[in-house]
């Protein structure tokens, strides 16, 4: 079948990086500069993406693959194939229409992107707050208040694992 198809359609023989040139008797011609074809049998080459402005080139365009962009420092990619760049904020902030703003009390963001999220409500799980939340960190929930009644053993965090060959300080 492949052989018959290629007899019927000479364009199917054109490999990636070329196009089937109707103006030249359907000869396979190389893609012109700043264009590419990622599959065989193409009748045209696609224009390469240009990474300009807030975008910068992560991978140059070749005759067989499109350029890939990322964002300049201080920005991060959004969308498929980095279709958008968005400004980074500091931890403890979120990006609004007026720039980076601190998280409101009771919310936190531990990344340079995304929105401020509410602290975990420990009481919903019948637990108590072991470590208070901040703008940058969620609260840490501990055992329920009942577990902390007199006589109950207190919660102690596990000792940090020591690396082999290091003596305790």
């Amino acid at each position: 079948f492949e052989r018959t198809r290629s007899l019927q359609d000479p364009c199917s023989n054109c490999p990636a990086g070329t196009f089937c040139d109707n103006n030249r008797n359907q000869i396979c011609s190389p893609c012109p500069p700043n264009s590419f074809s990622s599959a065989g049998g193409q009748r045209t080459c696609d224009i390469c993406r240009q990474c300009k402005g807030v975008f910068r080139t992560r991978k140059e365009c070749s005759s067989t693959s499109n350029a890939e962009c990322d964002c300049t420092p201080g920005f991060h990619c959004l969308g498929a194939g980095c279709s958008m760049c968005e400004q980074d904020c500091k931890q403890g902030q979120e990006l609004t229409k007026k720039g980076c703003k601190d998280c409101c009390f009771g919310t936190f963001n531990d990344q340079k992107r995304g929105i401020c999220r509410p602290w975990t409500n420990c009481s919903l799980d019948g637990k108590s707050v072991l470590v208070n939340g901040t703008k940058e960190r969620d609260v840490v929930c501990g055992p329920s208040p009942a577990d902390l009644s007199p006589g109950a053993s207190s919660v102690t965090p596990p000792a940090p694992a020591r690396e082999p060959g290091h003596s305790p300080q």
């Epitope: 993406r49 402005g53 910068r56 300049t72 420092p73 279709s83």
Partner: nanobody, 125 residues
Amino acid sequence: QVQLQESGGGLVQPGGSLRLSCAASGYTYSSNCMGWFRQAPGKGLEGVAVICTGGGSPSYADSVKGRFTISRDNAKNTLYLQMNSLRAEDTAVYYCAADLLRAGTPLSSYEFNYWGQGTLVTVSS
């Protein structure tokens, strides 16, 4: 308080040149992107050029490529737009913008936080 002040607009003959300046105060200019936009009478806002620190090459609208050049002077906290071979269709109020929030590929998608008041460029014989 961030302030952007454009200057350098005026009346110029077709084929002539102008250099627009945008002085930024209260803004850490070097850490982000800045751009020039324009609004012709009765038209919407159009992206002209954007330049970013640490980025690739500046981005220009097709209508000004090869004629306009965007540049900046970090020491003076100033953005420039050199406009050559001016045409009647370049007549517009030109605005500078700073502190890019987010952007797609077309200049029209660039969302800036701060804007100047604008300077009028009239190209006429």
